[in-house]
């Protein structure tokens, strides 16, 4: 009975290994809401997929507890900057948990991309990448936020994205 | 008979797990061809290796279908820039598939690094990192392209590289 | 006897798979020593953890040989720059091995972030991310170095970090 149980467990593990949780969500025209909320993402079209994770209002929702490598890239760009050279961009991955009322910072970057544009009419591009391993419980959510989101450039889902996989 | 089959399958899976596909390719003097093609990479010397993936003319070639975390970093630098502050660099990972005649953009970054050289010295450095999970079929290929590749600096294989592993 | 051995091996593997080596270490006030040594890291508090890897004086120490995706991000920032606009930052992951007296470069980035600050009193932010797959033997160590570390900004463990997981 014990060995049979172990056997079942192994079979189960093999099956679950086949669907090791992973996701890659892509930027879309609807990603930037301007509402102060997190970025929204495409979950099905093109390169986007969900496997063993779910999605809700910008958040990757964990269904199986464990350690996950989570990542996000955002494409930044503009013609000049809203606050000139002093403009700072904060790009972060944040956790929402039922056990705590506020979002928790997981991985964060700050950049001053506008120093690259020495006049108000100068076109500039920059990119911010974040990635790291965090522990997530079932039901917890991860979202991406960018402040100032006016500087995020979206096009075809290849330049701004958000993903995770269990390690 | 069934259990024996399952047993064989588990044994097989254990062996394949031991060779979970992974690769890390490094930049070399021959990486930049100037031909308009993708960057070429070192596959064996130093830190470079291929495990369960193959290589052909700059491309990582998939032998086992699945979801892969693919990544690339390029070291950028120069003395001034060919187009001044307007110089833009596009660094991307692209998929080649037998089912489609053109390369497909997977992950892309655009940067304007030349604003980093604002003093008389004109010397600047920048770096671009890309990483994300994509689904790849057996026989499909992934390549790295950089436009303008004149701004890529190669030295010892640690500053510009390209890799992947199955998740 | 053979099958029982295989069974034990599978059970063992399942257990070891449950503890696939992984770690995420976070920046802390004590990270910057100014001694010329590597950065030091928080290993337990907050988001930091070690699972199947150990830590010693800034180094992730490998206990199980294999291929690892190693990564680090450092948050850079300042008011002006110590060497003016020409300041270059080198951020790297380095291997220490008992078989060789010197550290070996694994993944390295160079950046000139200060070109973003067009006057000596200008505040600027930048970020450097590195990640890639390397083979590590049991007992080998990986450390993070940043030159010039005066430009690294630490706050709460989310902006500068160091991690790894076996692939």
């Amino acid at each position: 009975d014990g060995p049979a149980g172990s056997w079942e467990q192994l079979i189960q593990e093999r099956r679950s290994h086949e669907v090791n949780p992973a996701a890659h969500l892509t930027g879309a025209n609807s990603s930037l809401t301007g509402s102060g909320g997190p970025l929204l993402w495409e979950t099905q079209l093109g390169l986007a997929f969900l496997r063993g994770l779910s999605y809700h209002d910008g958040a990757l929702v964990v269904t199986k507890a464990g350690y996950y490598y989570i990542y996000s890239k955002v494409q930044l760009g503009g013609v000049g900057c809203p606050l000139g050279l002093a403009s700072t961009i904060t790009h972060g991955l944040y956790k929402r948990t039922p056990r705590y009322p506020e979002e928790l910072e997981l991985l964060v970057s700050q950049q001053s991309p506008c120093g690259r544009a020495t006049s108000s009419s100068r076109v500039w591009w920059d990119s911010s990448f974040l990635g790291g391993v965090v522990h997530l419980e079932a039901g917890e959510e991860v979202v991406v936020r960018v402040l100032d989101e006016r500087l995020v450039r979206l096009r075809d889902g290849t330049r701004s994205y958000f993903g995770a996989f269990m390690v | 008979d069934g259990p024996a089959g399952s047993w064989e399958q588990l044994i097989q899976e254990r062996r394949s797990h031991e060779v979970n596909p992974a690769a890390h390719l490094t930049g070399a003097n021959s990486s930049l061809t100037g031909s308009g093609g993708p960057l070429l990479w070192e596959t064996q010397l130093g830190l470079a290796f291929l495990r369960g993936l193959s290589y052909h003319d700059g491309a990582l070639v998939v032998t086992k279908a699945g979801y892969y975390y693919i990544y690339s970093k390029v070291q950028l630098g120069g003395v001034g820039c060919p187009l001044g502050l307007a110089s833009t660099i596009t660094h991307g990972l692209y998929k080649r598939t037998p089912r489609y005649p053109e390369e497909l953009e997977l992950l892309v970054s655009q940067q304007s690094p030349c604003g980093r050289a604002t003093s008389s010295s004109r010397v600047w450095w920048d770096s671009s990192f890309l990483g994300g999970v994509v689904h790849l079929e057996a026989g499909e290929e992934v390549v790295v392209r950089v436009l303008d590749e004149r701004l890529v600096r190669l030295r010892d294989g640690t500053r510009s590289y390209f890799g992947a592993f199955m998740v | 006897d053979g099958p029982a051995g295989s069974w034990e091996q599978l059970i063992q593997e399942r257990r070891s798979h449950e503890v696939n080596p992984a770690a995420h270490l976070t920046g802390a006030n004590s990270s910057l020593t100014g001694s010329g040594g590597p950065l030091l890291w928080e290993t337990q508090l907050g988001l930091a953890f070690l699972r199947g890897l150990s830590y010693h004086d800034g180094a992730l120490v490998v206990t199980k040989a294999g291929y690892y995706y190693i990564y680090s991000k450092v948050q850079l920032g300042g008011v002006g720059c110590p060497l003016g606009l020409a300041s270059t930052i080198t951020h790297g992951l380095y291997k220490r091995t008992p078989r060789y007296p010197e550290e070996l470069e694994l993944l390295v980035s160079q950046q000139s972030p200060c070109g973003r600050a067009t006057s000596s009193s200008r505040v600027w932010w930048d970020s450097s991310f590195l990640g890639g797959v390397v083979h590590l033997e049991a007992g080998e160590e990986v450390v993070v170095r940043v030159l010039d570390e005066r430009l690294v900004r630490l706050r709460d463990g989310t902006r500068s970090y160091f991690g790894a997981f076996m692939v």
Partner: antibody, heavy 119, light 111 residues
């Protein structure tokens, strides 16, 4: 083939301004930097600065800052160098020189324009 | 600014012989393994002509008898077998820092 054709010789009085043109052909004009270099009698070559035709961005040798102005007319693939407050020591042959593919050398040059400053 | 010093000021060499011209920079002109040093030839009434870029790269269309070497602060232009058309003034030029600066020139004359 690549050609840079400059405007003709000029004679100017001290305090006046001169504007020299350099018309490019035979290549994609906006892809290459244009530099200005002068050679005074009995002197060596002196770099005055550069212009990026793609954007109009300019970098000047500090020595000429405030007196030299580089402009571009992309419609005619022409760059201009204007030098004001002329003095006798500005008497020289002025050259435009195209930035090479690797942009930190000058691979094609105009034939030169002699500017004489004399009262 | 970076000062470029060429020597000798005048070099007299017979046709068919080898000529070696030197150029010293007041500070290193190297970046990431490349030297930002160029050599030009100028004849009377003509614009300069690029011979060597990045210290040792021969410009397209320039005869192989011209070669460049050096790194850091010391550079050499060598003409292996002088032809009659090689007698001219030669300038070195650094491009690592603004303002770009030239040496004062070496006049290569027929001996």
């Amino acid at each position: 083939q690549v050609q840079l054709v400059q405007s003709g010789a000029e004679v100017k009085k001290p305090g006046a301004s001169v504007k020299v043109s350099c018309k490019a052909s035979g290549y994609t004009f906006i892809d290459h930097i244009m530099n200005w270099v002068r050679k005074a009698p009995g002197q060596g070559l002196e770099w005055m600065g550069r212009i990026y035709p793609v954007s109009g961005e300019t970098n000047y040798n500090q020595k000429f800052m405030g007196r030299a102005t580089f402009t571009v007319d992309r419609s005619t693939s022409t760059v201009y160098m204007e030098l004001s407050s002329l003095r006798s020591e500005d008497t020289a042959v002025y050259y435009c020189g195209r930035g090479s593919y690797y942009w930190n050398a000058m691979d094609y040059w105009g034939q030169g324009t002699l500017v004489t400053v004399s009262s | 600014e970076i000062v470029m010093t060429q020597s000798p000021a005048t070099l007299s060499v017979s046709p068919g012989e080898r000529a070696t011209l030197s150029c010293k920079a007041s500070q290193s002109v190297d970046f990431d393994g490349d030297s930002y040093m160029n050599w030009y030839q100028q004849k009377p009434g003509q614009p300069p002509r690029l011979l060597i870029y990045s210290a040792s790269n021969l410009e397209s269309g320039i005869p192989a008898r011209f070669s460049g070497s050096g790194s850091g602060t010391e550079f050499t232009l060598t003409i292996s077998s002088l032809q009659s058309e090689d007698f001219a003034v030669y300038y070195c030029q650094q491009s690592i820092e603004d303002p770009w600066t030239f040496g004062q020139g070496t006049k290569l004359e027929i001996k």
